[in-house]
Interface confidence: low
């Protein structure tokens, strides 16, 4: 039996994946639940099994096709339903008209690498993954650098207001270990949110030359 309120949130990665989280504050005991996606104007539908991520929330990924295939466009509407088994039938627990390009969350940037490092600066590049060609150059990035003795939460955010897949970090301390992360967000979409942070890239600045300030 299910009681209480629920929250059903989904994001489209702009290519072929819709990730959903369903939260339910009542108890769900030994109940099988799934998300069903039914596009209004396409010849496919898709289902994924909701798996627990905490005591009261479940998640699943709707895999719509090959990772880089463009499965939905800006005018698609996908009816998303949470269905939970009740005996021999399925009960609709939540429903939403999902507009993919209003609810975007891209994949985290990948292939971070140090292009050039000096004593006080470091040039880093990255790539975006599975991002739709519809965005053209309409993307922005946030980056952060982890300094020794600090946490990621304390790291100041650097904003790149254009599709720029590199950054030159300045005023770094020589011979110091740093970590760097970046995330991406399309400019499009009322409910669009930032991608997850990339995997951290560790790098070390060069030591200062003896008797010389470089």
């Amino acid at each position: 039996a299910v009681n209480g309120t629920s929250q059903f949130t989904c994001f489209y990665n702009s290519r072929a994946n819709i990730s959903c989280v369903w939260s339910q504050d009542g108890a769900l005991q030994d109940t099988s639940c799934q998300v069903h996606a039914w596009p209004d104007r396409r010849r496919w539908n898709q289902t994924c099994e909701l798996l627990p991520v905490s005591q009261a929330s479940w998640a699943c990924n709707l895999i719509l096709g090959a990772p880089d295939s463009q499965k939905l466009t800006t005018v698609d509407i996908v009816t998303l339903r949470v269905l939970c088994r009740e005996g021999v039938r399925w009960r609709v627990m939540a429903i939403q008209d999902f507009k993919p390009f209003e609810n975007l969350r891209l994949m985290a940037p990948i292939s971070l690498q140090v292009v050039h490092v000096e004593t006080h600066r470091c040039n880093i590049s990255w790539e975006i993954s599975q991002a739709s060609h519809y965005f053209e150059r309409h993307l922005e990035f946030e980056a952060r650098t982890l300094s020794p003795g600090h946490t990621w939460e304390e790291a100041p955010l650097l904003t790149l207001k254009q599709k720029q897949e590199w950054i030159c970090l300045e005023t770094l301390t020589p011979d110091t270990q740093y970590e760097f992360q970046v995330r991406v967000k399309p400019l499009q979409g009322e409910f669009t949110t930032w991608s997850p942070w990339s995997q951290p890239l560790a790098f070390r600045t060069k030591p200062a030359a003896l008797g010389k300030d470089t």
Partner: antibody, heavy 119, light 106 residues
Framework: EVQLLESGGGLVQPGGSLRLSCAAS????????VHWIRQAPGKGLEWLGV???????DYNAAFISRLTISKDNSKNTVYFQMNSLRAEDTAVYYC?????????????WGQGTLVTVSS | DIQMTQSPSSLSASVGDRVTITCQAS?????LYWYQQRPGKAPRLLIY???NLASGVPSRFSGSGSGTSYTFTISSLQPEDIATYYC?????????FGQGTKVEIK
């Protein structure tokens, strides 16, 4: 069999309002979007808006200030309301539904209802 | 809005003739549809997703194209094909139609 039946057309005064109904059968409006399209006499087709299965709407920006599309799921009926009518709104108004697992595009159309705006 | 421009606006051909209608979009579109509308009737879907024949549509109708340029063909015109034909894009709101091509029999 999928069927759409429009009603509510007729003569409307300039400046007045129009409320049309689209009764659906053979499918549920909780599973499919229903679109409204019009055709002025001797002219082409013009898309006005849609109400999706969950109740959200998309409108042609040219009509957004005076157009409301709603529905009653229990009656399996979609409603179209347009305000501040003028002579150029005289047209046959159609409701239509996209196809399903076989194809998309406007596969199903109502027979249309004629609205005449005149004093 | 994406403008859909059909040509010709009207044509007259003999039974058995091959008839071609073009549809030019003002910007690239992903999904293109063709409809037939006989006088006094609602439109009927003929072609979906550029080149696929809708259910129950005779094989003499076909469609092709990509980007901004699309073509609709009737390989052998029949008397029952007298109608107005419309293209329509479903890539960007508002959904838009071509102005129509009226096909008549000589």
């Amino acid at each position: 069999e999928v069927q759409l039946l429009e009603s509510g057309g007729g003569l409307v005064q300039p400046g007045g309002s129009l409320r049309l109904s689209c009764a659906a059968s053979g499918f549920s409006v909780t599973s499919y979007g229903v679109h409204w399209i019009r055709q002025a006499p001797g002219k082409g087709l013009e898309w006005l808006g849609v109400i999706w299965s969950g109740g959200s709407t998309d409108y042609n920006a040219a009509f957004i200030s005076r157009l409301t599309i709603s529905k009653d799921n229990s009656k399996n009926t979609v409603y179209f309301q347009m305000n501040s009518l003028r002579a150029e709104d005289t047209a046959v108004y159609y409701c239509a539904r996209a196809g399903d697992a076989n194809y998309d595009g406007f596969a199903y159309w109502g027979q249309g209802t004629l609205v005449t705006v005149s004093s | 809005d994406i403008q859909m421009t059909q040509s010709p606006s009207s044509l007259s051909a003999s039974v058995g003739d091959r008839v071609t209608i073009t549809c030019q979009a003002s910007q690239s579109v992903s999904f293109l549809y063709w409809y037939q509308q006989r006088p006094g009737k609602a439109p009927r879907l003929l072609i979906y997703d550029t080149s696929n024949l809708a259910s129950g549509v005779p094989s003499r109708f076909s469609g092709s194209g990509s980007g901004t340029s699309y073509t609709f063909t009737i390989s052998s015109l029949q008397p029952e094909d007298i109608a107005t034909y419309y293209c329509q894009q479903w890539s960007t709101y508002p959904l838009t139609f071509g102005q129509g091509t009226k096909v008549e029999i000589k």
